[in-house]
């Protein structure tokens, strides 16, 4: 999916107003310097890219993320903002329904976690140079 | 304007069944995140169940089972098939728009249930 | 799922300060919203994402949330905001929504 024409500062209110506590609940009794930004993006629709990916696609020693409460707000949100984002999902949800995992929070999912936090640092201040 | 619009409510026998159904207008129907709220009279809000775009569904416990929930984008409706009703099903049922999954920014008038012999 | 627990009924004069509160396991680690409720009528939103408010509400409602209590805070009280507030949060096992039992707010 390209997310060039989403309405980013909509996601960006979603994100500030109901997903980034979720994501800091998750990580609760983590410490924040535990684990380093791997993951980067460049402008909001590749940080979106990355998001996506992170969030919904199952990595090795962490297949669980797609399930969890900030999963689900933010596949709302690009539903809402993104158009034809939904239509787009339609057929990949069908596949993931098939390979449901049980929702176990891994170190790996963890680290994951914390590359999403950044992600999503990165998309909220756009106008950053690259580090 | 956003508009929600309950239909199929009525009075069932204990151990019946009933299919509700919500028009939505207004807004893009299939991105959104629908379910389906009630209220027992004079009693509190009671989340029944939801919906994703992509027909994943979710319920409550206390009707996982017995209800059902879909959604038929082409058309803006939302339905809500109730089967082997109880007592305790009797209430208010309003349709809602789930904001961003986790909240409620607009409901329906409501279609009331009446489950008695 | 998590259990969300209000006051029945909260009593305040005209243009005094109203506060009900909605208790629950490490709430302040969720996300709490609040609807008002008037007799006959489906609820309206009036706060989001513990402290925001949808566009139309009154500036005198805000919220706030913090260890295992939020609170929805009415300032000036009108006999208009005489109404059921519902608190709603969200359980993080079963992702499921849920609500508080609905505070009855009388103005005297």
């Known amino acids: 999916y390209d997310f060039t024409n989403c309405d980013f500062e909509k996601i960006k209110a979603a994100y500030l107003s109901t997903i980034s506590k979720d994501l800091i609940t998750y990580m609760s009794g983590t410490k924040s310097t535990e684990f380093n930004n791997t993951v980067s993006c460049s402008n909001r629709p590749h940080c979106l890219t990355e998001i996506q990916s992170l969030t919904f696609n199952p990595t090795a020693g962490c297949a669980s993320l797609a399930k969890e409460m900030f999963a689900m707000k933010t596949k709302a949100a690009l539903a809402i903002w993104c158009p034809g984002y939904s239509e787009t999902q339609i057929n990949a949800t069908q596949a993931m329904k098939k390979r449901r995992k049980r929702k176990v929070t891994t170190n790996k999912c963890l680290e994951q976690v914390s590359q999403l936090q950044g992600l999503w640092r990165r998309f909220n201040r756009p106008l950053l140079k690259q580090q | 304007q956003v508009q929600l619009v309950e239909s199929g409510g009525g009075l069932v026998q204990p151990g019946g069944s009933l299919r509700l159904s919500c028009a939505a207008s207004?807004?893009?129907?299939?991105?959104?995140?629908m379910s389906w709220v009630r209220q027992a009279p004079g009693k509190g809000l009671e989340w029944v169940s939801g919906t994703f775009f992509d027909g994943s569904t979710y319920y409550a416990d206390s009707v996982k089972g017995r209800f059902t929930i879909s959604r038929d984008n082409s058309k803006n409706t939302l339905y809500l098939q109730m089967n082997s009703l109880r007592a305790e099903d009797t209430a208010v049922y309003y349709c809602a728009r789930q904001q961003y999954f986790d909240h409620i920014d607009i409901w329906g008038q409501g279609t009331l249930v009446t489950v008695s012999s | 799922d998590i259990e969300l627990t209000q006051p029945p009924s909260v009593s305040v004069a005209p243009g005094q300060t109203a506060r009900i509160s909605c208790g629950g396991d490490?709430?302040?680690?969720?996300?709490v919203y609040w609807y008002q409720q008037k007799p006959g009528q489906a609820p309206v939103l009036v706060i989001y994402?513990?402290?925001k408010r949808p566009s139309g509400i009154p500036e005198r409602f805000s919220g706030s949330n913090s260890g295992n209590t939020a609170t929805l805070t009415i300032s000036g009280t009108q006999a208009e905001d005489e109404a059921d507030y519902y608190c709603q949060s969200y359980d993080l096992k079963s992702l499921n929504v849920v609500f508080g039992g609905g505070t009855k707010l009388t103005v005297l």
């Open positions: 994402g513990d402290s």
């Open positions: 207004g807004f893009t129907f299939s991105s959104y995140y």
């Open positions: 490490s709430l302040g680690g969720k996300y």
